[in-house]
Interface confidence: low
């Protein structure tokens, strides 16, 4: 007997690392293997149209799963039976079951990270599951789906007792049949009074809505078409065994004539439109490395040619509650360093024939901005900066300090929270910028914190190119060039003139241009010129010069 279908459900979740063996396998969902790797592509079995009461349940045969060690998933049952009540409308939802409406538009949808990654699930004790799609591709995507959180116990099979009364021309004769639907979907009919036997339907009628699952064999590169019927049907030319048509070549049509003793001629002629080979498609991560912290790009690539009409191929992605009917999807504004799960499938003529799931972890994001605590100078040649590190992951810091147009940058260890700047220029404004960075798929720099300080004054350097020249017998002209480093706020030149050890003149000018008059004739003088920056005097430049004997 087939497993009891779960309530229709859709979950976005991180793949569990161990099989959830106690959970029921939903009808027509692909069993994925445990996510020891982040991607698995599967052969897919699919039911696409509503089933008649004769076919209320189907099961995925174990060999259709590519020998996967299957774990069970809570997914959307692809069995859609408008003729009969389903679990979705007959079963009271268990505690912790939400109902959510999904639509094909992702405009207002928010993609949440998979539970169990960096995001915190808001359902206590929730277990992560793989997800599947609403699988009837011809139904609108605005189906209301029940988001089923796992229960380790399978839901009990629902038994529906339906009394069918057949009225005949003999008014006093009533035929009452009780039809019990067993979990396998076969009908057990207990008859109390049989007055009339309804005529058999034609096989063309009975199997009008027959559905097919295509199972691919990667070794032989051939498909098997599994006919979704409960009874063992017969096929013309003995083309099928156990309701399976074997050895179908990709992209070729095959015709199967279906009959059964429960129906009459004409037989159902089923045209099998075989999809392309599964390995001709590859799900490719097309995310740009620069944007891999907040975006995910996934794209189906055709890696080999095939003869199927590409117009008949449709693609579908589901990431969280967003569904896209595109060959390529791009998700933006995601959280860095979070895992996101995307399921995708390819359909041929609305028959699903392959699927893949990817769990992608977004890259490390840019680190936050460090918070500067101290940033100042209390000395002429040193400064200090201390900071709080950013909250997000980072590898190291870059500290840059700029004076006028010169810029120096240092790479600092991630554990540092303080740096002493040495050999700075006195009385100079320094602008500092500090940012953290992380080397991920690319290097990402965080926002820079900025600060500035001005170093303290220091003694200026010596004046240079000092000259002393006689302008007359008792007059001298003293000139010099400004110091290379002023190291302070002001600009003043001083000249001291000594004769022997006696200071005879002390002058101060804005420019280094002194005219010294009325000196003693024939006397040796010492001329000392220095610069004063308002805080400190510089080293004097010293020259000796003598006045001449008066010419008059």
């Amino acid at each position: 007997q087939s497993p009891t279908p779960s309530p229709t459900g859709l979950t976005t979740a991180k793949m569990p690392s161990v099989p959830l063996s106690s959970d029921p396998l939903p009808t027509h969902t692909t069993a994925f293997s445990p996510a020891s790797t982040f991607e698995r592509e599967n052969d897919f079995s699919e039911t696409t149209t509503s089933l008649s009461p004769d076919n209320t349940s189907t099961q995925v045969s174990p060999d259709s799963l590519d020998n996967a060690s299957a774990f069970n998933t809570t997914g959307v049952s692809s069995v859609q039976t408008p003729h009969l009540p389903t679990h979705a409308d007959s079963q009271t939802p268990s505690a912790g079951t939400d109902t959510q409406t999904f639509s094909g538009s992702a405009a207002n949808a928010k993609l949440n990270p998979t539970p169990g990654s960096n995001a915190i699930s808001d359902v206590p004790g929730e277990r992560s599951t793989a997800s599947t799609f609403p699988t009837d591709p011809v139904s609108p995507l605005t189906t209301t789906l029940s988001l089923a959180h796992h229960s380790s116990a399978a839901l009990p099979a629902r038994t529906s007792n339906t009394t069918i009364t057949a009225n005949t021309s003999d008014a006093y004769l009533n035929a009452s049949e009780t039809t019990t639907l067993s979990p396998s979907g076969s009908a057990v009919i207990s008859t109390t009074t049989i007055a009339t036997t309804p005529s058999k339907p034609t096989c063309d009628e009975k199997y009008a809505n027959i559905t097919v699952d295509y199972l691919y064999n990667k070794e032989t590169k051939l498909f098997t078409a599994k006919l979704n019927v409960n009874e063992n049907v017969e096929c013309g030319n003995n083309t099928c065994t156990n309701n399976e048509v074997h050895n179908l070549t990709e992209c070729k049509n095959a015709s199967v004539s279906i009959s059964h003793n429960s129906c009459t001629a004409p037989d159902k002629t089923l045209i099998l439109d075989v999809p392309p080979g599964v390995e001709k498609f590859q799900l490719h991560d097309c995310t740009q490395v620069e944007k891999a912290d907040t975006t995910i790009c996934l794209k189906w690539k055709n890696i080999e040619t095939f003869t199927c009409d590409t117009q008949n191929i449709t693609y579908r992605f589901q990431c969280g509650n967003m569904i896209f009917d595109n060959k390529e999807i791009k998700l933006e504004n995601l959280e860095p360093e979070h895992e996101y799960k995307c399921d995708s499938e390819i359909l041929y003529n609305n028959h699903k024939f392959t699927n893949a799931s990817k769990i992608i972890k977004t890259d490390f994001g840019s680190p936050g901005e460090p918070q500067i605590i101290f940033c100042r100078s209390e000395a002429a040649h040193q400064g200090v900066i201390t900071w709080n590190p950013p909250q997000r992951s980072f590898h190291n810091f870059t500290l840059c300090y700029i004076k006028e147009t010169e810029k120096d940058c240092l790479n600092l260890d991630k554990n540092l929270i303080k740096y002493d700047l040495q050999n700075l220029k006195p009385y100079t404004k320094y602008v500092l910028s500090l940012h953290a960075y992380i080397i991920a798929k690319v290097q990402r720099n965080g926002s820079a914190a900025m600060c500035h300080f001005t170093t303290k004054s220091a003694p200026p350097s010596q004046v240079w190119n000092m000259t002393v020249s006689m302008t007359s017998d008792n007059s001298m002209h003293v000139k010099c060039r400004p110091p290379r480093d002023r190291n302070g706020p002001h600009e003043r030149y001083h000249l001291e003139v000594e004769a022997g050890n006696t200071l005879v003149r002390n002058e101060s000018h804005k420019n280094c241009d002194f005219r010294v008059k009325d000196l003693q004739y024939s006397t040796d003088y010492t001329f000392k010129a220095y610069f004063h920056n308002g805080d400190y005097p510089g080293e004097p430049f010293i020259l000796h010069h003598s006045t001449s004997y008066n010419s008059k």
């Epitope: 918070q371 500067i372 605590i373 101290f374 209390e378 200090v384 909250q391 303080k418 600060c451």
Partner: antibody, heavy 122, light 112 residues
Framework: QEQLVESGGGLVQPEGSLTLTCTAS?????????MCWVRQAPGKGLEWIGC????????TYYASWAKGRFTISKTSSTTVTLQMTSLTAADTATYFC??????????????WGQGTLVTVSS | AQVLTQTPSPVSAVVGGTVSISCQAS????????LSWYQQKPGQPPKLLIY???KLASGVPSRFKGSGSGTQFTLTISGVQCDDAATYYC????????????FGGGTKVVVK
């Protein structure tokens, strides 16, 4: 000469409020300082209350016991205040204002004020 | 909350001798070295002696030495002088979404 002077201490009733002021001289807070308050009950040890970063972010940090009752603010380029509410006898202490707690910057060890005594009593 | 436990008071020292005061943190201080030592004399504010666990503050005699890392720190005074009689406090800095400081309970040093 750089200095810190605390003011505003005195006698206050239980459940009352008080604001202490720390005034800097010889420097201003434009230099991005880390101004902290520390208290010392009579005959007891030092207890950290909280700190304010005087830079543009103006971040404040508090001891867990001080959150909610104590608020540190920069009121001018040379003053920082400590607002205290719901005072009890356990808050009786000398309150110190300190700069650069636990650090030395360019040869300047952390600067402390002389403290101001707060007595909570009815 | 972080707790810093110091050597119980009082600790006796003799002039010229050596005295060690320990400070144990309940959690590693930030960067394993964000610990400073203060000296306080009656009626005075504390004075910084050691910062970053082992760096000597300016103007502090070299007979004061700080050592340790993580959770265990020691202040050693060698060649003790009468002027060293005071209470010594350790101060730990922690960072977790913001700064947090904690003082040790203090250790009184009596010089004989």
């Amino acid at each position: 000469q750089e200095q810190l002077v605390e003011s505003g201490g005195g006698l206050v009733q239980p459940e009352g409020s008080l604001t202490l002021t720390c005034t800097a001289s010889g420097f201003s807070f434009s230099g991005n300082y880390y101004m902290c308050w520390v208290r010392q009950a009579p005959g007891k040890g030092l207890e950290w209350i909280g700190c304010l970063y005087t830079g543009s972010s103006g971040s404040t940090y508090y001891a867990s016991w001080a959150k909610g009752r104590f608020t540190i603010s920069k009121t001018s380029s040379t003053t920082v205040t400590l607002q205290m509410t719901s005072l009890t006898a356990a808050d009786t202490a000398t309150y110190f204002c300190a700069r650069d707690l636990g650090y030395e910057i360019d040869g300047y060890g952390g600067l402390w004020g002389q403290g101001t005594l707060v007595t909570v009593s009815s | 909350a972080q707790v810093l436990t110091q050597t119980p008071s009082p600790v006796s020292a003799v002039v010229g001798g050596t005295v060690s005061i320990s400070c144990q943190a309940s959690q590693s201080v930030y960067n394993n070295n964000n610990l400073s030592w203060y000296q306080q004399k009656p009626g005075q504010p504390p004075k910084l002696l050691i910062y970053d666990a082992s760096k000597l503050a300016s103007g502090v005699p070299s007979r004061f030495k700080g050592s340790g890392s993580g959770t265990q720190f020691t202040l050693t005074i060698s060649g003790v002088q009468c002027d060293d009689a005071a209470t010594y406090y350790c101060l730990g800095g922690y960072y977790s979404s913001g700064w947090y400081f904690a003082f040790g309970g203090g250790t009184k040093v009596v010089v004989k």
